[in-house]
Amino acid sequence: LQDPCSNCPAGTFCDNNRNQICSPCPPNSFSSAGGQRTCDICRQCKGVFRTRKECSSTSNAECDCTPGFHCLGAGCSMCEQDCKQGQELTKQGCKDCRFGTFNDQKRGICQPWTNCSLDGKSVLVNGTKESDAVCGPSPADLSPGASSVTPPAPAREPGHSPQ
């Protein structure tokens, strides 16, 4: 025998209290598939979240973050403070990248500049807080008098945590 609930479309639920009639989802709830015995409660976007997409009877609300914050996790499960390019978020707030490191985004941690000399190449463009070093040809490939000195990128200080 076919389950009468399987006929209930998305946006409704199979109401056991009413002889398994398909009832519309109550306000602030939704069902995204047919045959549901309950509707799910809509996600609320509070605090530093803002509503990207309103909840409907067939789909959940979607949140993103208010300006100055960016999403983390699947479905924007949390917001994190933006920093400027050339900075990283530490437990004391946004801090400039240390010498020898860069961050070209508003999120994430500062990364060490590419060490061109490790690949036997010269530095074409020096690294900055906001951008990586750009490597050029190896010094041997350069014409006489056009050699470039590549200081090694300093390592992070021991114990430095990128949090």
Epitope: F49, L72, G73, M78, E80, Q81, I109, Q163
Partner: antibody
């Protein structure tokens, strides 16, 4: 079935440090925020700080800033809480707790680790 | 930081309705969760995002949050509900605050 298993009880001297571990099993480790919450004897719950392992992002309650460090090792699905410059008032049960993905509730808790600070 | 204030204790007769309040500036603008803790045990989430009940939590537990106050309501209170209850708030970032806790006594 998600489980958070914490390291065993510790007895520490004032001024020293303690590092408590919290190993997660039965779920995705790197996308869920792990928080550390402590409870002194007969007192309430106190949020210390948390980390989202997959993002390397940590944050701390103002009261503990500079004294607590929370880290995570994705390869072993383990979070750590290190508290330094211990004093007798730090005697407490320390819990790790996992936040639900999209909402604000801590749906899974470790069994707790008693840290006793005594000279 | 938002500060959350709870009454230290609430008493209720079996079968009656217990209400535990949690107040803080503009608390209704943030998410509120509630935890039950029995002696010697880890806390258990009973309400999240103001009014949602995790699976396995009895229907007699409900929550609301507006203005400056979040409320945990236990209707038809049972002896097994005697415990400490903590509210907690979340603003969407990696930052959480707990209230001081309320001891619920079932008379």
């Amino acid at each position: 079935q998600v489980q958070l298993v914490q390291s065993g009880a510790e007895v520490k001297k004032p001024g020293s440090s303690v590092k408590v571990s919290c190993k997660a099993s039965g779920g995705t480790f790197n996308s869920y925020a792990i928080s550390w919450v402590r409870q002194a004897p007969g007192q309430g719950l106190e949020w210390m700080g948390g980390i989202i392992p997959g993002f390397g992002t940590a944050n701390y309650a103002q009261k503990f800033q500079g004294r607590v460090t929370i880290t995570a090792d994705e390869s072993t699905s383990t979070a750590y809480m290190e508290l330094s410059s211990l004093r007798s008032e730090d005697t407490a049960v320390y819990y790790c707790a996992r936040k639900n993905e999209e909402d604000g509730g801590f749906d899974h808790w470790g069994q707790g680790t008693l840290v006793t600070v005594s000279s | 930081d938002i500060e959350l204030t709870q009454p230290p204790s609430v008493s209720v007769a079996p079968g009656q309705t217990a209400r535990i309040s949690c107040s803080g500036d503009n608390l209704g603008d943030y998410y509120a969760s509630w935890y039950q803790q029995k002696p010697g045990q880890a806390p258990v989430l009973v309400i999240y995002d103001d009014s949602n009940r995790p699976s396995g939590i009895p229907e007699r537990f409900s929550g609301s949050n507006s203005g400056n106050t979040a409320t945990l309501t236990i209707s038809g209170t049972q002896a097994e509900d005697e415990a400490d209850y903590y509210c907690q708030t979340w603003d969407g970032t990696l930052h959480f605050v707990f209230g001081g806790g309320t001891k619920l006594t079932v008379l």
